[in-house]
């Protein structure tokens, strides 16, 4: 089994690891499928691509019968199988079988924290946000290891790219020193950003 790892939105080339000459194409059937669902077929030189792959998939016959998937999505992850059948003695017989496992990485960038003064009060508001990752994120605010209550946390998913965006607001009393951590967990991974507030100098700075 061949393993291919790519970033989301990139191009993945999955090789069947087999070549068929132009002359042999008329007697050859080629199938690409993902977990038993059809991706594309080529029968006697005529190709057919299944609807969910039509707008993103290309068949490169000259390069080991590879399929090229453009604009990778998280749902493209999985095991692809290439089957080559050749017509011999009144029947199609299997000439080649290959499996390719595709992993699609979609890491959230380090979140950014911006802050706003709320007029006529000692309250300051900070907003932590990041986007472009997968799977669904869970955001939490921490101070001294203790979880804080956010005002509101929104998680949205782009239906086209399948990627998530997350944003959360936190209000704090600006008369005391603070060190807040915005922690985002997704799958087995995590990213974080720290926001420090110093009352003596009335300044703040994120840790990078």
């Amino acid at each position: 089994v061949i393993h291919v790892t790519k970033e989301v939105k990139e191009v993945a080339t999955l090789s069947c690891g087999h070549n068929v000459s132009v002359e042999e194409l008329a007697q050859t059937r080629i199938y690409w499928q993902k977990e038993k669902k059809m991706v594309l077929t080529m029968m006697s030189g005529d190709m057919n691509i299944w609807p969910e792959y039509k707008n993103r998939t290309i068949f490169d016959i000259t390069n080991n019968l590879s399929i090229v998937i453009l604009a990778l999505r998280p749902s493209d992850e999985g095991t692809y199988e290439c089957v080559v059948l050749k017509y011999e003695k009144d029947a199609f017989k299997r000439e080649h079988l290959a499996e390719v496992t595709l992993s699609v990485k979609a890491d959230f960038p380090t979140p950014s924290i911006s802050d706003f003064e709320i007029p006529t009060s000692n309250i300051r508001r900070i907003i932590c946000s990041t986007s472009g990752g997968f799977p669904e994120p869970h955001l939490s605010w921490l101070e001294n290891g203790e979880e804080l209550n956010a005002i509101n946390t929104t998680v949205s998913q782009d239906p086209e790219t399948e990627l998530y965006a997350v944003s959360s607001k936190l209000d704090f009393n600006m008369t005391t020193n603070h060190s807040f951590m915005c922690l985002i967990k997704y799958g087995h991974l995590r990213v974080n950003q720290t926001f420090n507030w110093n009352t003596t100098k009335q300044e703040h700075f994120p840790d990078n």
Partner: nanobody
Framework: EVQLVESGGGLVQAGGSLRLSCAAS????????MGWFRQAPGKERDFVAA????????YYADHVKGRFTISRDNAKNTVYLQMNSLKPEDTAVYYC??????????????WGQGTQVTVSS
């Protein structure tokens, strides 16, 4: 740079035939396939058919299967689109394009200027 020049368009009655040509010049060796697309007034550009440089493999959009045939002449560096049983809904500007990846509906890089096909009822 690749240059593509389409020809063969015109006015034809429903049920009639036309043969479009696309002459390619320049760095065509960097492409693995060529395709035909069409764009009707006020609509998006739609895939019609594609063929590998060797001519051994073809790919058609469902709405033209059985009516249109794509072929190529390597000696002339030209790709053809034979259009039979034409319908008024086939009226569009037809473009040819090159694909550096292979056979498919996407990934095309160089485009011709287009040739108008009008099918009257």
């Amino acid at each position: 740079e690749v240059q593509l020049v389409e020809s063969g368009g015109g006015l034809v009655q429903a049920g009639g035939s036309l043969r479009l040509s696309c002459a390619a010049s320049g760095r065509t060796f960097s492409s693995k396939a060529m395709g035909w697309f069409r764009q009707a007034p006020g609509k998006e550009r739609d895939f019609v058919a594609a063929i590998t440089w060797s001519g051994g493999s073809t790919y058609y959009a469902d709405h033209v299967k059985g009516r249109f045939t794509i072929s190529r002449d390597n000696a002339k560096n030209t790709v053809y689109l034979q259009m039979n049983s034409l319908k008024p809904e086939d009226t569009a500007v037809y473009y040819c394009a090159t694909n550096p990846y292979g056979l498919g509906q996407v990934g095309y890089d160089y485009w011709g200027q287009g040739t108008q096909v009008t099918v009257s009822s």
